[in-house]
């Protein structure tokens, strides 16, 4: 069928709570294509009607919620104008009880299920969240062996954990509880996380953390502006250069004579061990041809991308 | 549960490059630290280095200017590269990784270790 | 570099004997690592976060300590307990080992 097959690495997932999968490999999905959805080589497409337990919005999948019989293989095609994907998605569907203690820690969880605090730093866990646009999330709520996080040393930000001062103690059982909205309907999402403890410097103290851009898409309006944010932490004697570049150049230096899209000011807040830094990027105006184009936001070594997308269209307009 | 395993020539020629693989099941090696350690021949334990779960490497200084760790994330395999060998490099080369009670540097899973002698 | 120095170096006990390793280190380290290691066979981890006995480890074993000086003990030693035995730190890298203790039968 002349598409070009992809293997993604297994994910293994929670049974009775929402999950969503995004279909995005760029560069191929930065251009115009079209994404569809299948289950185990059927050839009917994942139903894209909204009421559906299971549908393709967008160029996600989304299971609200996912069930036992959700496990198998799902493709999501992309054809372009001359080219085809298909990308093999390997879903397994387990049911686990996160205050269960006698389990200590589980081999086969996706790696963001598995995090690493550095003793005697101040370090942050990760509530990785990937929900389309249609999906509203509530504010998120972190518990440790079934208990809620209080204490000075916690910090909620965004979606991370700050842990001041990181002690033994801190390794164990995590979770992080989000309630998830669409269509009316509210869902419990809870991810649980093994967090191991570590003497060692990490990544040698040197490589900056690109919070958020996580290369991922934003729906944006023609003629609209648009203010991104780039979220970095970095060690607190860094000497790396954060930016936000477009085709490989500073976009300052790029939109040099419209000045339609600037680089902002950066800002930092300073913990214990780290710094978090902000640095973002205004459009003062969309235009056509800022779709599809990778933003990419640069710190040191690191980089992450944005790209903006048209709006689905609005069909209940009519 | 996690099992490791070594493997490469036992007999390597002064000068040459010294090249084992150690192979990963019951764990991915895209988690966690993964750690090669070598006991010379009626002498002590020597910390070679190590590649994180983010492909990040750590190699013990005295050894730095002739070691490399790789991996191949699709294999579930790491490797140790040993360039310009000599007889003081003969020992028993051991690949493990922690991650006992949620403890990265409790190395509680070892290979079986693998004798590497440099002799022309 | 912090070093580890182990003592004694080697040991000859009795089975029944209440026997101490100490390991040294030059500069403070936040915790202590312990491996057994017998002939022809790959270290196990004894000992971790100074004090926490690895699956397996008989309770005759302890581990205590802290900054420089961290010790093992065993509180009556038995004929499967001759062995190597080595300290390692995470604190500072290098990691190093000590030199190894080695525990032979009188």
């Known amino acids: 069928d002349g598409c070009n097959d992809i293997f993604m690495k297994n994910e293994m997932l929670s049974a009775s709570q929402p999950f969503a999968f995004n279909c995005t490999f760029p560069p191929i999905t930065s251009g115009e294509v079209s994404v569809t959805w299948y289950k185990n080589s059927s050839k009917i497409p994942v139903s894209k009607i909204i009421q559906s337990r299971i549908h393709q919005d967008e160029t996600w999948i989304l299971f609200l919620p996912m069930e036992w019989g959700d496990s198998g293989v799902y493709q999501c095609v992309i054809k372009g104008r001359d080219s085809c994907h298909r990308i093999h998605v390997n879903l397994t569907v387990f049911e686990k009880q996160w205050c269960d203690t006698s389990v200590k820690g589980l081999p086969n969880l996706s790696d963001e299920y598995k995090q690493i605090l550095h003793l005697g730093k101040d370090d942050s866990l990760t509530c990785h969240l990937h929900f389309p646009k249609s999906c509203i999330l509530g504010p998120i709520k972190w518990y440790k062996d079934c208990n809620e996080i209080t204490g000075e040393r916690f910090t909620v930000l965004e979606t991370r954990l700050l842990v001041s001062n990181v002690s033994a103690e801190d390794r164990g059982n995590y979770a992080c509880q989000v309630i998830l909205t669409h269509s009316g309907k509210q869902y419990e999402v809870l991810n649980g996380i093994t967090v191991s403890i570590t003497e060692r410097a990490g990544y040698g103290g040197s490589v900056p953390k690109i919070i958020y851009p996580k290369n991922n898409s934003i729906e944006v309006q023609l003629g609209t502006t648009l203010i991104v944010d780039c979220n970095i932490t970095d060690t607190k004697d860094n000497t790396n250069l954060r930016c936000w570049r477009v085709n490989n150049t500073l976009v300052d230096d790029y939109y040099n004579e419209s000045k339609r899209i600037r680089e902002g000011v950066e800002t930092h807040a300073s913990f214990r061990e780290y710094n978090l830094y902000t640095v973002n990027i205004t459009f003062l105006e969309v235009k056509m041809e800022d779709y599809g184009l990778p933003f990419m936001c640069h710190a040191g070594v690191s980089a992450a991308y944005i790209m903006l997308q048209l709006p689905a269209p609005d069909f209940r307009a009519y | 549960q996690v099992q490791l395993q070594e493997s490469g020539p036992g007999l390597v020629k002064p000068s040459q490059t010294l090249s084992l693989t150690c192979t990963v099941s019951?764990?991915?090696?895209?988690?966690g630290y993964w750690n090669w350690i070598r006991n010379h021949p009626g002498k002590g334990l020597e910390y070679i280095?190590?590649?994180?779960?983010?492909?990040?490497?750590y190699y013990n200084p005295s050894l730095k200017s002739r070691v490399t760790i790789s991996r191949d994330t699709s294999k579930n395999q790491y490797y140790l590269k040993l360039s310009s060998v000599t007889a003081a490099d003969t020992a028993v080369y051991y690949c493990a990784t922690g991650g006992y009670d949620y403890v990265e540097d409790a190395l509680y899973y070892w290979g079986q270790g693998t004798l590497v002698t440099v002799s022309s | 570099d912090i070093q580890m120095t182990q003592s004694p170096s080697s040991l000859s006990a009795s089975v029944g004997d209440r026997v101490t390793i100490t390991c040294r280190a030059s500069s403070n380290v936040r915790y202590m690592y312990w491996y057994q290691q017998k002939p022809g066979k790959a270290p196990k981890l004894w000992i971790y976060?100074?004090?926490n006995l690895a699956s397996g480890v008989p309770s005759r074993f302890s581990g205590s300590g802290s900054g420089t000086s961290y010790t093992l003990t065993i509180s009556s030693l038995q004929p499967e307990d001759f062995a190597t035995y080595y300290c390692?730190?995470?604190?500072?890298?290098?990691?190093?080992f000590g030199q190894g203790t080695k525990l032979e039968i009188k």
């Open positions: 390692q730190q995470y604190t500072t890298s290098p990691y190093t």
């Open positions: 019951g764990a991915s090696i895209t988690s």
């Open positions: 976060l100074t004090s």
């Open positions: 280095g190590y590649i994180s779960y983010s492909g990040y490497t």
